[in-house]
Interface confidence: low
């Protein structure tokens, strides 16, 4: 009977523990369901945010393209409405740019070409007057687009046209032969012949945009 | 003894059930911890996405403003005639003319005024860079619109505004007193103080015409 009582007591304890555990499991199950629900909500939230982010990226990309197009148009239009680009001098029918670096004749020619221009070409005494005045405050030489292969060749402009003899007299190394040819520079209003491999400033020239505004 | 056996059997069952439940609880606990961890990761993910979205929104806003500005500028520029007169250099918002004659400061000022301009005013390091580059091939001095009555007075631009001290250091005759005042000239990129009565080249400046016509 004593054993029996002890067993009954243990049984009661175990039943109590079992019920308690079942309760805990039930509670955990509910919590788990809630957690699962919350996790699903979070996943949904992530999906929404990821979608929004993707949309924003698309919009941004679109805006960026718009922006680039506008900048491109602006460049075009700015150059359309202005006779000459920024930093160039507009004179009569031409735009002139005085280089800010010293290079040999060929490199100077390349620099002008990259700006959709050519080295200076003097067509008239009026052109010469303007250039002489524009460089009057410089003691440095400026390459122009005039060169010849050697003294037995004629002086030619970049476009292949010959130099008009009445325009100016070329001084300096006119009878010298150089492997890279002889090129003309203008300095303090006078034009000189020199070895094309030497470094000098240069003057680029292109047609001014004088279409109806 | 029969009761005892029955109780023992029930006890064994209960113990078995209890162990099973405890195992379940343990498993659920682990699952819960894993779920918690996963939830934390999801929350972190959400935070990151939300931050990215916010950044994207800011960038987009900025791009949007840039776009509006570009559109505005485009409208303005599209209706522009030449930003600067012939022989002037257009740079950013201004037109610059490098004089072809040497005069004292006052006479230089008059010459600029007659062209509806003022002597050079440098507002920023960008302005200074442009001017330094533009005169890089000259070794001559150019008057700018900066002067002072004597060393106890501040350096003032023609419009009365003071010189920003960080822009450049003025060299030369800074502590000298001249009856005609002290004026500033720029030469080979550096700014010097000199007697205003001396003759030098000069740089005129006026606003570029970028308004809608």
């Amino acid at each position: 009977s004593q054993v029996s009582n002890l067993l009954k007591q243990q049984q009661t304890n175990l039943t109590h523990q079992k019920n308690k555990l079942e309760g805990q499991i039930s509670a955990r199950q509910q919590a788990e369901e809630a957690s699962q629900e919350s996790q699903n909500e979070l996943k949904e939230m992530i999906e929404t945010l990821a979608w929004k982010l993707n949309e924003k990226s698309k919009e941004q990309m679109e805006l960026h393209h718009q922006n680039l197009n506008l900048q491109e148009t602006l460049k075009r239009v700015a150059n359309c409405s202005a006779p000459c680009p920024q930093d160039w001098i507009w004179h009569e029918e031409n735009c002139y740019l005085f280089s800010t670096g010293s290079f040999n004749w060929e490199k100077s020619q390349e620099k002008c070409l990259s700006l959709d221009a050519k080295l200076l070409k003097i067509n008239s005494t009026a052109d010469l007057d303007f250039i002489q005045q524009a460089i009057s405050y410089s003691s440095f030489p400026f390459w122009m687009g005039l060169s010849r292969r050697n003294p037995s060749y004629p002086w030619l402009w970049e476009d292949g046209s010959p130099l008009m003899p009445h325009l100016f007299r070329i001084r300096g190394a006119v009878s010298q032969t150089y492997p890279s040819g002889t090129c003309a520079y203008i300095q303090r209003g006078a034009v000189y012949a020199e070895n094309c491999i030497l470094a000098a400033f240069s003057i680029c020239q292109k047609k001014a945009n004088l279409r109806a505004q | 003894s029969q009761v005892s056996n029955l109780l023992k059997q029930q006890q064994t069952n209960l113990t078995h059930q209890k162990n099973k439940l405890e195992g379940q609880i343990s498993a659920r606990q682990q699952a819960e911890e894993a779920s918690q961890e996963s939830q934390n990761e999801l929350k972190e993910m959400i935070e990151t996405l939300a931050w990215k979205l916010n950044e994207k929104s800011k960038e987009q806003m900025e791009l949007h403003h840039q776009n509006l500005n570009l559109q505005e500028t485009l409208k303005r520029v599209a209706n522009c005639s030449a930003p600067c007169p012939q022989d002037w250099i257009w740079h950013e918002e201004n037109c610059y003319l490098f004089s072809t004659g040497s005069f004292n400061w006052e006479k230089s000022q008059e010459k600029c005024l007659s062209l509806d301009a003022k002597l050079l005013k440098i507002n920023s390091t960008a302005d200074l860079d442009f001017i330094q580059q533009a005169i890089s091939y000259s070794s001559f001095p150019f008057w700018m619109g900066l002067s002072r009555r004597n060393p106890s007075y501040p350096w003032l631009w023609e419009d009365g505004s003071p010189l920003m001290p960080h822009l450049f250091r003025i060299r030369g005759a800074v502590s000298q007193t001249y009856p005609s005042g002290t004026c500033a000239y720029i030469q080979r990129g550096a700014v010097y103080a000199e007697n205003c009565i001396l003759a030098a080249f000069s740089i005129c400046q006026k606003k570029a015409n970028l308004r809608a016509q």
Partner: antibody, heavy 115, light 107 residues
């Protein structure tokens, strides 16, 4: 920074040739010509000629024409000056220098011509 | 060829003195003139180019002037490190010729 580093001293017999190198660094080699100047012991400076590394075009002083050759290897930014049919009066320090005016110079290479 | 003649060929001076070296070309060289300084066993160093432009890093006590065929190098106040040989060179027409040099010695 800009540097021109020349090859070491040479001792040659009359009639032989010498090739002096000049390695450039610190700037775009093809943008600036390289000049060669020599200085006999206790004497002044004498310009020999120049090469433009971009085009390979060279100009030589008349007195060296036919004896001097200036070349370059743009892949290693190096200019060369070769002087042939050496005579005892070619004994000198040979300098390479950049551009005109010559703003950077090599350290010089002593070429001794002696039998 | 253009001949370049420097004078004097040597000059003795003291620290603090003002020294002038002249260079005459056999024809006008349109300011295409440079001045170099050379110390024993060293390569020449560019001081002045385009007749009057000071090379960066060169002390302002050195100055150049002149036009046409006549040019001058001036050292306003001699410093111990200025004792050296000075050369002028024209770079208008090849061959680019040098003056024979002026040796500046301590008095």
């Amino acid at each position: 920074q800009v540097q021109l580093v020349q090859s070491g001293a040479e001792v040659k017999k009359p009639g032989a040739s010498v090739k002096v190198s000049c390695k450039a660094s610190g700037y775009t080699f093809t943008d600036y010509e390289v000049h060669w100047v020599r200085q006999a012991p206790g004497q002044g400076l004498e310009w020999m000629g120049a090469i433009h590394p971009g085009s390979g075009g060279a100009a030589y002083v008349q007195k060296f024409q036919g004896r001097v050759t200036m070349t370059r290897d743009t892949s290693i930014s190096t200019a060369y000056m070769e002087l042939s049919r050496l005579r005892s009066d070619d004994t000198a320090v040979y300098y390479c220098a950049r551009w005109l005016p010559m703003d950077y110079w090599g350290q010089g290479t002593l070429v001794t011509v002696s039998s | 060829d253009i001949q370049m003649t420097q004078s004097p060929s040597s000059v003795s001076a003291s620290v603090g003195d003002r020294v002038t070296i002249t260079c005459r070309a056999s024809q006008g060289i349109n300011n295409w003139l440079v001045w170099y300084q050379q110390k024993p066993g060293k390569a020449p160093k560019l001081l002045i180019y385009a007749a009057s432009s000071l090379q960066s890093g060169v002390p302002s006590r050195f100055s150049g002037s002149g036009s046409g065929a006549d040019y001058t190098l001036t050292i306003s106040s001699l410093q111990p490190e200025d004792f050296a040989t000075y050369y002028c060179q024209q770079y208008l027409i090849t061959p680019y010729t040098f003056g024979q040099g002026t040796k500046l010695e301590i008095k």
